[in-house]
């Protein structure tokens, strides 16, 4: 049986200051049970970008629509991107624990560049 | 059309075993955990146990006592009971789950159910 | 772990007649709820699911509404077949997945 694979097409995505940056990321099965989170960095000191279950992300939508059944896209996109937005992305998949989610699997990163606003 | 077809219930005394199964076709079953949710007679629905992959989650109620497994080579699920007490009597139900997105787990299909009574 | 309530425990309706009836939950589950009917002898079948979305197959007379601790499921002219119980279940936050302890909807 394949174990689930996080997938990241892109290694890395320019965008002009101020547009919208769209992150792609997809897993190749439902299972194992747990929830997908964005990071901005790896290790320790990595920040939540978005989290489906808690907290508040204003600039971050998702491609797919939040209702869609037994859904595999968990592209992101990130609205009125700023030069401070730059940095890799990853999308990693968390194996549902009791009481805390375990880190299961990361995709490999996509780099975001933000490009100077066109005058 | 998906089916769910569970087995191996009857009756059995406190302290002793069964083992339930499930025949699932009709959807890739190796692609969606599956769950067994239980309800004794006249009362509620009360969720038992859930397999993804290789995760597996239990209620406290059976935690220690209860095993659940899957053949993907067999598109079968399974309960193992153990230690079986009074308060397990109850048709127990096989179901598959579905997920919303982002979201957690819920129940599209379920078996007819198979009765399990636990009584001297 | 969180607790659904459902109530009233039971409803009686004439045919043709408004069914409402409700599900708290004791925290917030955002619109993670879903909801069953059991007729008697048979197994629960899924309604309706992210509080608001109808199961493919499912007569347009059931709707969900309600986010956060208080849903509503609403049958509207309710047809002989609805006679049953049904249940209501929260997946947002588990294990355990729970479920409410169900509404019986008889014949007046």
């Known amino acids: 049986e394949d174990e689930l694979q996080v997938i990241q097409p892109e290694k890395s995505v320019s965008v002009a200051a101020g547009e919208s940056a769209t992150l792609r990321c997809a897993m190749t099965s439902l299972i194992p049970v747990g929830p997908i989170m964005w990071f901005r960095g790896a290790g320790a000191g990595r920040e939540l970008i978005y989290n489906q279950k808690e907290g508040h992300f204003p600039r971050v939508t998702t491609v797919s629509e939040l209702t869609k059944r037994n859904n595999l896209d968990f592209s992101i996109s990130i609205s009125n991107i700023t030069p401070a937005d730059a940095g890799t992305y990853y999308c990693v998949k968390f194996r549902k624990g009791s009481p805390d989610d375990v880190e299961f699997k990361s995709g490999a990163g996509t780099e975001l560049s933000v490009r100077a606003k066109p005058s | 059309d998906v089916q769910l077809v569970e087995s191996g219930g009857g009756v059995v005394q406190p302290g002793g075993s069964l083992r339930l199964s499930c025949a699932a076709s009709?959807?890739?079953?190796?692609?969606?955990?599956m769950t067994w949710v239980r309800q004794a007679p006249g009362e509620g629905l009360e969720w038992v146990s859930t397999?993804?992959?290789?995760?597996?989650y239990y209620a406290d109620s059976v935690k220690g006592r209860f095993t659940i497994s899957r053949d993907n080579s067999k598109n079968t699920l399974y309960l193992q009971m153990n230690s079986l007490r009074a308060e397990d009597t109850a048709v127990y139900y096989c179901?598959?789950?579905?997920?919303?997105?982002?979201?957690?787990?819920?129940?599209?299909?379920w078996g007819l159910g198979t009765l399990v009574t636990v009584s001297s | 772990e969180i607790v659904l309530t459902q109530s009233p425990a039971t409803l009686s309706v004439s045919p043709g007649e408004r069914a409402t009836f409700s599900c708290r939950a004791s925290?917030?589950?955002?619109?993670?709820l879903a909801w069953y009917q059991q007729r008697p002898g048979q197994a629960p079948r899924l309604l309706i699911y992210?509080?608001?979305i109808r199961e493919t197959g499912i007569p347009e007379r059931f709707s969900g509404s309600g986010s956060g601790t208080e849903f509503t499921l609403t049958i509207t002219s309710l047809q002989s077949e609805d006679f049953a119980v049904y249940y209501c279940q929260q997946y947002y936050d588990w294990p355990p997945f729970t479920f409410g302890g169900g509404t019986k909807v008889e014949i007046k």
């Open positions: 925290q917030n589950v955002k619109n993670d």
């Open positions: 009709g959807f890739s079953f190796s692609n969606f955990a």
């Open positions: 397999i993804g992959s290789g995760d597996t």
């Open positions: 179901a598959k789950d579905s997920t919303v997105s982002w979201s957690g787990d819920f129940f599209d299909y």
């Open positions: 992210a509080a608001r």
